[in-house]
Interface confidence: medium
């Protein structure tokens, strides 16, 4: 088994606490609302949102994958950290066992925030990770972030 690690950083004009509340804690409700072209629904399969919770994320017709199942690994409300793993569906299968993701939202002096994202692809055997898969995952994350960010900018009363 191999582990391939990809790390990215992206910035947001939204303060860290507000972004964590909307993007992380209420993403299940917000993503289908603000980015229906990317995510059609998020369904809690088991758990209450804390570690061990399993969520099924369904994608609209026309996207490469029908769904993925995510497992929540850690939610740190104090340090704005969220760890989860993609454990079923989507790219998970013969060559890929799981994807472990870590997101940390850090406040910046200008009142915005930086999202530090780590994606660890756990492959089976000697398989490698396809560059297209990493790119698609990054683009999905960016789409969701910008959608949430724009929603928050337009609705100043939300998630304060």
């Amino acid at each position: 088994m191999g582990v391939f690690n990809y790390e990215t950083e992206t910035t947001s004009v939204i303060p860290a606490a507000r972004l964590f509340k909307a993007f992380i804690l209420d993403g299940d409700n917000l993503f289908p609302k603000v980015a229906p072209q990317a995510i059609s629904s998020v369904e809690n399969i088991e758990g209450n949102g804390g570690p061990g919770t399993i969520k099924k994320i369904s994608f609209p017709e026309g996207l490469p994958f029908k769904y993925v199942k995510d497992r929540v690994d850690e939610v740190d409300h104090t340090n704005f950290k969220y760890n989860y793993s993609v454990i079923e569906g989507g790219p998970i299968g013969d060559t890929l066992e799981k994807i472990s993701n870590e997101i940390k939202i850090v406040a910046t002096p200008d009142g915005g925030s930086i999202l530090k994202i780590s994606n660890k692809y756990h492959t089976k055997g000697d398989h490698e990770v396809k560059a297209e898969q990493v790119k698609a995952s990054k683009e999905m994350g960016e789409t969701l972030l910008r959608a949430v960010e724009s929603y928050l900018l337009a609705h100043s009363d939300a998630y304060n």
Epitope: V34, P36, Q37, R146, S150, Y151, L153, A154
Partner: antibody
């Protein structure tokens, strides 16, 4: 094909109430914001407000807050725009339209409902 | 009420190009890649022509293109045809104002 079909033209008197409708088809109705857009005779487009049918989250543009009520029924895939007391100045064409993207664009548009308010 | 600024009218001869501008602020046009353009023929519903500044929906002619510089977005129609005669509206996502803003509209006349 994604489509929005609106109810027919209405002629009303000032002070009367009215509800016009917009039925969506060809897509997951509960997952997309619907906007209502007003066009007064010979004038431009004004966004009145938007609703997310999935949870009825509704946002009104300031000049329409308290003047109209926007609602939706996911079981019939229908959005509504309602007035409790019409004024002559409400005369115009009202379009329902699905919001796409972030949501940041309007597509497709309903055919429009002409509302005439006259004594 | 606040709206994006468009010229009331523009005109051009068949085959020519015309450009319609749409000026806002850094809170709307300049702040996002989220300007869209709509064509409206008399007595008809508007139709989406450009979204997210430069993208063209399927079915819209390549003669229509969008661009943006700073707080001003532009719609350019090349190779003007008689059927392009219509009203054109820009729209931008916005912050801190009514969150959905249309321009006042521009009447395009094909001479």
């Amino acid at each position: 094909e994604v489509q929005l079909v609106q109810s027919g033209a209405e002629v009303k008197k000032p002070g009367e109430s009215l509800r016009i409708s917009c039925q969506g088809s060809g897509y997951r109705f509960s997952n997309y914001w619907i906007a209502w857009v007003r066009q007064l005779p010979g004038k431009g487009l004004e966004s009145m407000g938007i609703i997310y049918p999935g949870d009825s989250d509704t946002r009104y543009s300031p000049s329409f807050q308290g003047q109209v009520t926007i609602s939706a029924d996911t079981s019939t895939r229908t959005a509504y725009l309602q007035w409790n007391s019409l004024k002559a100045s409400d005369t115009g064409i009202y379009y329902c339209v699905r919001l796409g993207g972030i949501p940041d664009w309007f597509d497709p548009w309903g055919q429009g409902t002409r509302v005439t308010v006259s004594s | 009420s606040y709206e994006l600024t468009q010229p009331p009218s523009v005109s051009g001869s068949p085959g020519q190009s015309v450009t319609i501008s749409c000026t806002g602020t850094s809170s709307d046009v300049g702040g996002y890649n989220l300007v869209s353009w709509y064509q409206q023929h008399p007595g008809k519903a508007p139709r989406l022509m450009i979204y997210e500044d430069t993208k063209r929906p399927s079915g819209v002619s390549h003669r229509f293109s969008g661009s943006k510089s700073g707080n001003t977005a532009s719609l350019t129609i090349s190779g003007l045809q008689a059927e392009d005669e219509a009203d054109y509206y820009c729209y931008s996502y916005a912050t801190g104002r009514p969150s959905r803003l249309f321009g006042g509209g521009t009447k395009l006349t094909v001479l």
